[in-house]
């Protein structure tokens, strides 16, 4: 049986093994086509979601479609209601909370009150003045806060009361992948883990742990990735694993927070990593622990020189690092976080690329998050 | 629309208190702030303060701190100015009004006389 | 404080002229935290315009109010009979909020 299933697929009426290798190869084998179904699917960037939630306060702001202008909500007459809908309309399934903010006197937005219109939230006409002088601050999900705060110090090994959110992601029960934990349904991680085997069968995720071997894993329900393009395979390194049962969240077991989609990160803003990758580059072995290090963010006009990733570096992707190198993610931390802390975690970018591991002048790559808000958006609604 | 019914005409002595309400209906208390500005006879207007009733803290203009508190009670949905140690100077109309930055619906006024 | 200055201190205007009332802040505030309000004799002050230029609701089109930094207009393109009060600008922005000394528009 455990050799059937590791070599071969059961297609049914009639009932007849193929070779597991057909799978997901584009050729319907199956009569039924289901050798074809469970794999990694794309999943288009979609159109505008127009809500959206600022890094002042977590703030909500509500789009026009009429106009293309942003404007942010008031208080006044907000309810939960709204509230639910606004995080519906960004995917989410469970319970907000929000609370009133006083407008900042650097308010750059116009300010308008906002009402309910076929499940989307609108500016209601002719709304007057805020009269609450607050805007709505809105929490889709709680997320972010650890059990424990990490130093600051060069690399050491992690434990999971820090980075709750962190997952192994493995095929034939081989670590490939790190992940994070985003909602009890879904992980987000690097495209590029699922680009030689892209039947979502095999893999799994494993979450509540720092030890690779030690935890249960979890079934994949779907992969869902971007357009793949071939001409640069570097671009989109996004994906989104929606687990077949929700996960129950502990001390040990949470979720990261998505970045604002205004969080721009200055050079040198510190920044951590984590992962079980490859200790050295070209050899070394996987690391059975976690391990974390501290970063920063690296300009990216820096990380484009000539001395260094010469323009492949895209404003979809971002670099960080440490100066003098020495201290980068490497094979096997793929998919995993790189993230900021501010009142909470905050995943900023995806475990991607790099030439060598640690170099000076070539630090890690990273899929930029805030860049791809719309489209992680667009498929939880799509999936809601 | 937000309507503000204010208390009546007070007369009050130098070094005493005054506590004038402002008490709204339609709309929801809770979500707007109330301000306070008053105008003294034959004078412009001036910032006293405001509260938002869903936070509870008040603010306050610098020149009234520590003789004015503005309160809000959300059940019969009425907002509070008290002023004290008053002096000839505070001779006014007391006014509330909905809003924060930009003042909506304003209450009828209440004229506060002191006088020995 | 920032200080609201407005000028004329009164304007005598004929009806269905142009009125045109200034207020100049001492330092610059955002445009989205300007007011102006019309007060008559014995009543409480009405809001006309807020965010500098965005007319409240109820307020006919004749009044309209521009400008940024520190220097703000209000216009009201032909005077009625019932447009004859006090004018006071209002700034939002920095706290304390501050009210201008007023503009009366008087009949000429």
């Known amino acids: 049986k455990v050799i059937l299933d590791k070599y071969y697929f059961l297609c049914g009426q009639p009932l007849h093994f193929i070779p597991r290798k057909q799978l997901c190869d584009g050729e319907l084998d199956c009569p039924l086509g289901e050798d074809e179904e469970h794999c990694v699917k794309s999943f288009p960037e979609g159109p505008a979601v127009a809500v959206r939630l600022s890094k002042d306060r977590s703030t909500l702001q509500v789009l026009d479609s009429a106009t293309g202008n942003w404007f942010s909500a008031c208080f006044d007459n907000f309810t939960e209601a709204l509230a639910e809908t606004a995080c519906r309309q960004m995917g989410y399934s469970s319970k907000p909370t929000f609370r009133a903010v006083e407008i900042g006197p650097d308010q750059d937005l116009d300010v308008v009150e906002i009402t309910e219109n076929s499940q989307e939230l609108r500016m209601r006409n002719s709304s007057g003045p805020c009269l609450s002088g607050s805007l709505v601050s809105l929490h889709c999900l709680a997320c972010g806060k650890s059990l424990k705060t990490p130093r600051v110090v060069g690399v050491e090994e992690a434990s999971v009361d820090s980075w709750p959110w962190q997952v192994s992601i493995q095929y034939d029960k081989q670590h490939v992948c790190g992940g994070s934990i985003l909602d009890p349904h879904w992980v987000l991680t690097a495209a590029h883990c699922f680009r030689k085997h892209t039947d979502v069968f095999n893999w799994k995720v494993r979450a509540g742990s720092d030890k690779l071997g030690s935890f249960p894993s979890l079934a994949v329900a779907k992969i869902i990735i971007i357009e793949f393009n071939p001409m640069y395979p570097k671009d989109n390194d996004i994906a989104l694993m929606k687990l077949q049962f929700p996960l129950t969240f502990s001390g040990t077991v949470r979720p990261i927070c998505l970045p604002f989609f205004d969080e721009e990160l200055t050079p040198a803003t510190p920044l951590w990593i984590i992962g079980w990758g490859f200790t050295k580059q070209n050899g070394g072995k996987m690391s059975d622990i976690l391990l974390q290090a501290s970063v920063q963010v690296i300009d990216s006009t820096r990380c484009n020189a000539d001395d260094a990733y010469q323009g492949e570096v895209t404003e979809k992707m971002m670099c960080a690092g440490i100066p003098e190198g020495g201290v980068d993610t490497c094979q096997g931390d793929s998919g995993g976080p790189l993230m900021y802390q501010s009142d909470q975690w905050h995943v900023v970018g995806i475990v991607s690329w790099g030439y060598g591991c640690g170099g000076p002048s070539t630090p890690g790559v990273y899929t930029k998050v805030s860049a791809y808000l719309n489209w992680i958006y667009n498929v939880w609604k799509a999936e809601l | 629309q937000v309507q503000l019914v204010q208390s009546g005409a007070e007369v009050k002595k130098p070094g005493s208190s005054v506590k004038v309400s402002c008490k709204a209906s339609?709309?929801?208390?809770?979500?707007?702030?109330i301000s306070w500005v008053r105008q003294a006879p034959g004078q412009g207007l001036e910032w006293v303060g405001g509260?938002?009733?869903?936070?509870?803290?008040?603010n306050y203009a610098q020149k009234f701190q520590g003789r004015v508190t503005i309160t809000a009670d959300e059940s019969p949905s009425t907002a509070y100015m008290e002023l004290s140690s008053l002096r000839s100077e505070d001779t006014a109309v007391y006014y509330c009004?909905?809003?924060?930055?930009?003042?909506?619906?304003w209450g009828q006024g209440t004229l506060v006389t002191v006088s020995s | 404080e920032i200080v609201m200055t407005q000028s004329p201190a009164t304007l005598s205007v004929s009806p269905g002229e142009r009125a045109t009332l200034s207020c100049r802040a001492s330092?610059?505030?955002?445009?989205?935290?300007l007011a102006w309000y019309q007060q008559k004799p014995g009543q409480a002050p009405r809001l006309l315009i807020y965010?500098?230029?965005t007319r409240a609701t109820g307020i006919p089109a004749r009044f309209s109010g521009s400008g940024s930094g520190t220097e703000f207009t209000l216009t009201i393109s032909s005077l009625q009979s019932e447009d004859f009060a006090v004018y006071y600008c209002m700034q939002g922005t920095h706290w304390p909020y501050t009210f201008g000394q007023g503009t009366k528009v008087e009949i000429k």
């Open positions: 339609g709309g929801t208390f809770s979500s707007y702030a």
């Open positions: 330092q610059s505030v955002n445009s989205r935290f």
């Open positions: 509260i938002m009733p869903i936070f509870g803290t008040a």
């Open positions: 009004a909905t809003g924060r930055r930009e003042l909506l619906n």
């Open positions: 965010g500098a230029s």
